[in-house]
């Protein structure tokens, strides 16, 4: 029996990320006897729920059950039946639901109530549905990428498990972009913070981390676009908005009621002499960039240094992983390579935005027009946010790594959330006993 493998005791966990634009279900697995080790949990499945984010179901809550069915059934298939009852299920809702809660706490609770009712019908061990805070979203994203990069492991390796790993224990900062909010989280050089609201302290695997984090509500890519449109329509002379952030020849009618539906546009709201207006694309990166910059108030800063809107931001430190929409957008634009300089990215964006809409549609025939039409804005917004918002420079640009997956697991807050809620990140370094990790007898 020298090399006979013992049957491994595998555990599973499910986290639903209820984002502003869509919901994704993630299934994680890990060997039960190693659950306090770093880097042993990995993602086995991502299931994207068909339809919009859960906050859009506020007037049709009875449809939430059907909406979640396919992905929950997929989880039933992937996870062995013998493990169903033991498998924890968590749902975390992010900025889309934060915005709904700002409008009506009662309506937000109604949505979560129906979510619980729906998820309780499955054989898994449902733990709860809640709206996570922006601070949590930032912190858990930071934990996820550093866990997957092996930054919490005390064992130094002579080899690199992932391309970005520099084989040191310096943690990566986390840059997360969603539809309705964006988060920046990193360990600054200076341990003292001028803004306690932005300070988090962790003890993970026997080491203390003083982390800076901030979540900018309304500065996710979709809400930023609504903000920009609401700002620009204020000065339009008629119901035509010539917009540099859309390709030349692109046309779209927008309802003013849709524009002012979100709390994110309240500061730009005014009575307009029309109910609808038409966006006409003119495809000019430079003008689009200027328009986006007007969303960032940099004139006021009560600290030594700010990002924008008077929010403290310490000097940037170390490497950063940029994930979620930072990655999806830059990957679509083919700009995720480490070799592409910031100047080159800007150059490519200028070229992309100026391409006629008809040409774009032909080149990307398989892409939904709604998404396709917004890549010029989204790419420009990402550049503006990183450079002017967070003060990255042409030099520090090379410290940004656009990451989709690490070791097969998606970068994002969900893994960190599950690790925390299942107590799988010990404060102290676990003592490894000689036989505790033996799989062979």
């Amino acid at each position: 029996t020298q090399n006979k493998a013992l049957p491994e005791n595998i555990k599973y966990g499910i986290v639903l990320d209820a984002g502003s634009s869509h919901t994704s279900l993630y299934i994680y697995k890990w060997p039960a006897e190693k659950e306090n080790d770093t880097g042993v949990v990995h993602q086995v499945e991502e299931c994207r729920v068909k339809g919009p984010g859960i906050s859009k179901y506020v007037q049709k809550v009875n449809e939430i059950g059907i909406y979640l069915t396919d992905c929950m059934e997929r989880a039933r298939e992937v996870i062995p039946r013998s493990q169903h009852q033991e498998t924890p299920v968590y749902l975390g809702a992010t900025a889309g639901m934060r915005l709904l809660r700002m409008e009506s706490e009662e309506l937000a609770d109604r949505v979560l109530d129906v979510v619980e009712r729906s998820l309780s019908n499955y054989p898994f061990d449902f733990q709860g549905a809640r709206i996570i805070t922006g601070q949590e979203e930032g912190a858990y994203g930071w934990i996820t990428i550093n866990y997957l990069l092996g930054k919490f492991s005390q064992k130094t390796r002579w080899f690199s498990i992932v391309p970005y790993e520099t084989n040191n224990q310096e943690t990566f900062g986390a840059l997360d972009l969603g539809g309705a909010s964006t988060q920046i989280t990193f360990v600054p050089q200076n341990q003292t913070t001028e803004s306690p609201d932005n300070a988090l302290q962790f003890r993970l695997y026997g080491k203390d981390y003083n982390v800076y984090t901030h979540s900018f509500l309304c500065y996710g890519k979709d809400q930023a676009l609504w903000q920009k449109l609401a700002k620009d329509i204020q000065v339009a002379s008629n119901e035509i908005l010539r917009d540099p952030c859309f390709h030349p020849g692109y046309k779209k009618v927008v309802n003013v009621s849709d524009l002012y539906k979100t709390p994110c546009t309240k500061r730009f709201e005014m009575t307009l002499p029309f109910q609808q207006f038409e966006i006409q694309g003119i495809g000019n990166y430079q003008q689009c960039h200027q328009s986006v910059l007007e969303l960032f108030n940099t004139s006021y800063c009560p600290y030594s240094q700010c990002a924008f809107n008077g929010i403290f931001l310490p000097p940037l430190q170390g490497d950063f992983g940029a994930f979620s929409a930072f990655y999806f957008v830059m990957n679509f634009l083919n700009l995720t390579s480490e070799k592409v300089s910031q100047e080159k990215v800007t150059e490519m964006m200028k070229k992309f935005c100026s391409q006629p809409w008809e040409e774009i549609k032909t080149s990307y025939a398989g892409v939904k027009e709604k998404y396709l039409s917004e890549y010029c804005f989204s790419g420009t917004y990402i550049l503006s946010l990183l450079l002017q918002g967070y003060h990255f420079t042409a030099d520090s640009w090379e410290h940004i790594h656009f990451i989709g997956k690490i070791q097969g697991s998606d970068a994002g807050w969900t893994l960190g959330y599950m690790l925390n809620l299942t107590n799988m990140i010990p404060a102290e370094q676990p003592l490894s006993t000689p036989l505790s990790h033996s799989t062979y007898v």
């Epitope: 609770d109 979560l112 619980e116 061990d125 449902f126 733990q127 709860g128 809640r130």
Partner: nanobody
Framework: EVQLLESGGGLVQPGGSLRLSCAVS????????MSWFRQAPGKGLEFVTA????????HYADSVKGRFTISRDNSKNTVYLQMNSLRAEDTAVYYC???????????????????WGQGTQVTVSS
């Protein structure tokens, strides 16, 4: 951390009814599964019932099934235990408990991080 305050205990005759309340302050109430445990004189702590954050999942100990009902009112940040057909063996100190993002099933196993109330005495006697 949440704080819990039980009320409604007292002396009741066998076959009678009693309704316990547990008011929760601090924290977002719907994020907590709530539970009732009890401790009879000279005995260990016993699970009675638990309910999920929005009330769709409940668990009961076999000894109270069909007689006790747990419910919650999230607008009042309160969980209730309706006790009917009370018996002498239901005499105990009843403790309210809260666990954040933890299933009622795990509360039943006393797993996870649980916050406890100070308890309310229920005496069933003729």
């Amino acid at each position: 951390e949440v704080q819990l305050l039980e009320s409604g205990g007292g002396l009741v005759q066998p076959g009678g009814s009693l309704r316990l309340s547990c008011a929760v302050s601090r924290g977002t109430f719907s994020e907590y599964s709530m539970s009732w445990f009890r401790q009879a004189p000279g005995k260990g702590l016993e699970f009675v019932t638990a309910i999920s954050g929005f009330g769709h999942i409940t668990h009961y100990a076999d000894s109270v099934k069909g007689r006790f009902t747990i419910s919650r009112d999230n607008s009042k940040n309160t969980v209730y235990l309706q006790m009917n057909s009370l018996r002498a063996e239901d005499t105990a100190v009843y403790y309210c408990a809260a666990a954040w993002q933890t299933s009622p099933r795990r509360m039943m196993q006393m797993a996870g991080s649980i916050t406890w109330g100070q308890g309310t005495q229920v005496t069933v006697s003729s």
